[in-house]
Interface confidence: low
C-alpha cells in the first residue's frame, strides 16, 4: 500500500495510490468506499471515473493514466470509520533529460563491492511491454528486456545516473515510467568500532508468568556478529527464544542490527541473572546486560537504571 503521506511524482507518468486497509475492504464488500480530492480551490470533491478520463478506481487503488500537474493536492480514502490521507505533489518533467533530477534515488557503493541494479515494477508488471536501462541517458545493451539487471563488483567507471524506463500500454496508449538511481562509487571505507546502543546495564521490570522482549541494537560493520549469552549453557532454557536478527544499511554503508531475546512465562530462575548481548568484530567487543527484576522490587533500584 502507499503508506508515505507525502508523495512527489513526475507529470506524464502512470501513478497509483493504494490504501492500507485493502484486505479489510475485501471482507466488507458492501461497505461504501470513497475517494476524495481537495486542492486550493475545491474542498473534498469525490472522485469517480466521470471526474476525469485519466482516473480509474479499483477496490484498493486510485490510478492516474497519467498523472498531470493539476492533480497536485490532497487525496483521501474513506471507508466506514477508516480514513487515509496523502499529499500529492506533481512536478514538471525535465524535457531535456531522460530523468527528472528531483526524482532520483542516490546510492553509495564501495569500489570492488557487489553492485546491483534491477529494473522491476511489481504493480505494473503485467502491463509492461519492455524495459530499458539507461546510463547517463544512454541505453545499455542488456540481454533481458523484461527486467534488465546489472550485477557486478563495482568499479569507479560504474559511477553515473542509471534510469530504468518501463514501457507499457493502457487503453491503446503508450506510457512510460522512469526510476533513476544516482550511483556514486567511493573508496573502501574503514571499519567502525561496533557499538551497542543504549545503557550498558538495564533493569527490566517484569511479572512472573508474563513474557518480555529484550531488544539489543548495535551499529556495526557487515561482517560483525551480534549474539546473546545467558545462563551456564546457552539455549538450554526452552522458554528463551532468539528472534531473527534485523539489519538495515545506514546511508554511510554501515549496518544497524537489532536482535530480540524473547523470554516467555517468566519464572523465578529468570530473575536477577545477567542476559548479555555482545557485538564482536576485529575492532573489539561491546557488551550490554539486562537483568529482570520483579515489579514489586522496583523501588529498590534508582530510576536512571530502569527500562520498561
Amino acid at each position: 500500500c502507499t503508506s508515505r503521506p507525502h508523495i512527489t511524482v513526475v507529470e506524464g507518468e502512470p501513478f497509483y495510490l493504494k490504501h492500507c486497509s485493502c484486505s479489510l475492504a475485501h471482507e466488507i464488500e458492501t461497505t461504501t468506499k470513497s475517494w476524495y480530492k481537495s486542492s486550493g480551490s475545491q474542498e473534498h470533491v469525490e472522485l469517480n471515473p466521470r471526474s476525469s478520463s485519466r482516473i480509474a478506481l479499483h477496490d484498493c487503488v486510485l490510478e492516474f493514466w497519467p498523472v498531470e500537474l493539476n492533480d497536485t493536492g490532497s487525496y483521501f480514502f474513506q471507508m466506514k470509520n477508516y480514513t487515509q490521507k496523502w499529499k500529492l505533489n506533481v512536478i514538471r518533467r525535465n524535457k531535456h533529460s531522460c530523468f527528472t533530477e528531483r526524482q532520483v534515488t542516490s546510492k553509495i557503493v564501495e569500489v570492488k563491492k557487489f553492485f546491483q541494479i534491477t529494473c522491476e515494477n511489481s504493480y505494473y508488471q503485467t502491463l509492461v511491454n519492455s524495459t530499458s536501462l539507461y546510463k547517463n541517458c544512454k541505453k545499455l545493451l542488456l540481454e533481458n528486456n523484461k527486467n534488465p539487471t546489472i550485477k557486478k563488483n563495482a568499479e569507479f567507471e560504474d559511477q553515473g545516473y542509471y534510469s530504468c524506463v518501463h514501457f507499457l500500454h493502457h487503453n491503446g496508449k503508450l506510457f512510460n515510467i522512469t526510476k533513476t538511481f544516482n550511483i556514486t562509487i567511493v573508496e573502501d571505507r574503514s571499519n567502525i568500532v561496533p557499538v551497542l546502543l543504549g545503557p550498558k546495564l538495564n533493569h527490566v521490570a517484569v511479572e512472573l508468568g508474563k513474557n518480555v522482549r529484550l531488544n539489543c541494537s548495535a551499529l556495526l560493520n557487515e561482517e560483525d556478529v551480534i549474539y546473546w549469552m545467558f545462563g551456564e549453557e546457552n539455549g538450554s532454557d526452552p522458554n528463551i527464544h532468539e528472534e531473527k536478527e534485523m539489519r538495515i544499511m545506514t546511508p554511510e554503508g554501515k549496518w544497524h542490527a537489532s536482535k530480540v531475546l524473547r523470554i516467555e512465562n517468566i519464572g523465578e530462575s529468570n530473575l536477577n541473572v545477567l542476559y548479555n548481548c555482545t557485538v564482536a568484530s576485529t575492532g573489539g567487543t561491546d557488551t550490554k546486560s539486562f537483568i529482570l527484576v520483579r515489579k514489586a522490587d522496583m523501588a529498590d533500584i534508582p530510576g536512571h537504571v530502569f527500562t520498561r
Epitope: N191, V225, G235, K244, E245, T278, A280, T282
Partner: antibody, heavy 118, light 107 residues
C-alpha cells in the same frame, strides 16, 4: 585469496583425543565467527561447534557438548577443535567454515578426515 | 530437539524447474540457507538469509521461507546442478543445524 586449510586429522582409538587446526588466510580472521561442520561417510552435514570473532561466545551441538572444545588464536589466524573421549560415531570429514554477520557460511575448507577405530 | 526434514531425492529433466523443500517447526521465523555439495567436494553456499544469492551463483537458484517450509528452486535445471543439497537453519545465535540432504538427479 580467501582460504581455510584444515589439518590434524588421523586415526585414533575410541576414548582418545585429537586436536584439529584450521589456518585462515586472505581475510581479517578476527572479524568473523567460525564454525566446525562434519560429515560422516555417506551421510549428511552435521554442525559441530561455532565461536564468535573475539572467542567470547562458544556454541556446541548436543552430540559433542562436554567432549569437544572450540577455540581460536586471532594472532595466529587459526581456529582449533580439541576433541576428547572420541567415539566411533565421531568418524567423519571435519570442515571449518567462516560465518558472516548476515548468516552467510560462505567459505569452507577442504576438510580433514578423522577416523575413530580400534 | 529441533529437526529439519528434506526429501531424500528429487528428480528433474534438463531445462525443467526443481523444487527442494525443507520443513521444520516455525522455520519461517529462522533464517534458512542452502548448500550444494558435489561428490568429493566441500559444500558451496547457494542461498542465504532465506532468499539472497551470493555473487557467482547463477540466477536460476532462488529461495523462499515462510511458515514451516523453506524451498530451494532451480529453474532451467542443468546437468551441472546434479548434486546433494542441504538446508540449514540458524536456531540460536551462532548455533545452527542442517537438514538430512536431498540428492538432485538431472535425468
Amino acid at each position: 585469496e580467501v582460504q581455510l586449510l584444515e589439518s590434524g586429522g588421523g586415526l585414533v582409538q575410541p576414548g582418545g583425543s585429537l586436536r584439529l587446526s584450521c589456518a585462515a588466510s586472505g581475510f581479517t580472521f578476527s572479524s568473523y565467527a567460525m564454525s566446525w561442520v562434519r560429515q560422516a561417510p555417506g551421510k549428511g552435514l552435521e554442525w559441530v561447534s561455532a565461536i564468535s570473532g573475539s572467542g567470547g561466545g562458544t556454541y556446541y551441538a548436543d552430540s559433542v557438548k562436554g567432549r569437544f572444545t572450540i577455540s581460536r588464536d586471532n594472532s595466529k589466524n587459526t581456529l582449533y577443535l580439541q576433541m576428547n573421549s572420541l567415539r566411533a560415531e565421531d568418524t567423519a570429514v571435519y570442515y571449518c567454515a567462516r560465518i558472516r554477520g548476515d548468516y552467510r557460511t560462505d567459505i569452507w575448507g577442504q576438510g580433514t578426515t578423522v577416523t575413530v577405530s580400534s | 530437539s529441533y529437526e529439519l526434514t528434506q526429501p531424500p531425492s528429487v528428480s528433474v529433466s534438463p531445462g525443467q524447474t526443481a523444487s527442494i523443500t525443507c520443513s521444520g517447526d516455525k522455520l519461517g521465523d529462522k533464517y534458512a540457507s542452502w548448500y550444494q555439495q558435489k561428490p568429493g567436494q566441500s559444500p558451496v553456499l547457494v542461498i542465504y538469509q532465506d532468499s539472497n544469492r551470493p555473487s557467482g551463483i547463477p540466477e536460476r537458484f532462488s529461495g523462499s521461507n515462510s511458515g514451516n517450509t523453506a524451498t530451494l528452486t532451480i529453474s532451467g535445471t542443468q546437468a551441472m546442478d546434479e548434486a546433494d543439497y542441504y538446508c540449514q537453519a540458524w536456531t540460536h545465535s551462532l548455533s545452527t543445524l542442517f537438514g538430512g540432504g536431498t540428492k538432485l538427479t538431472v535425468l
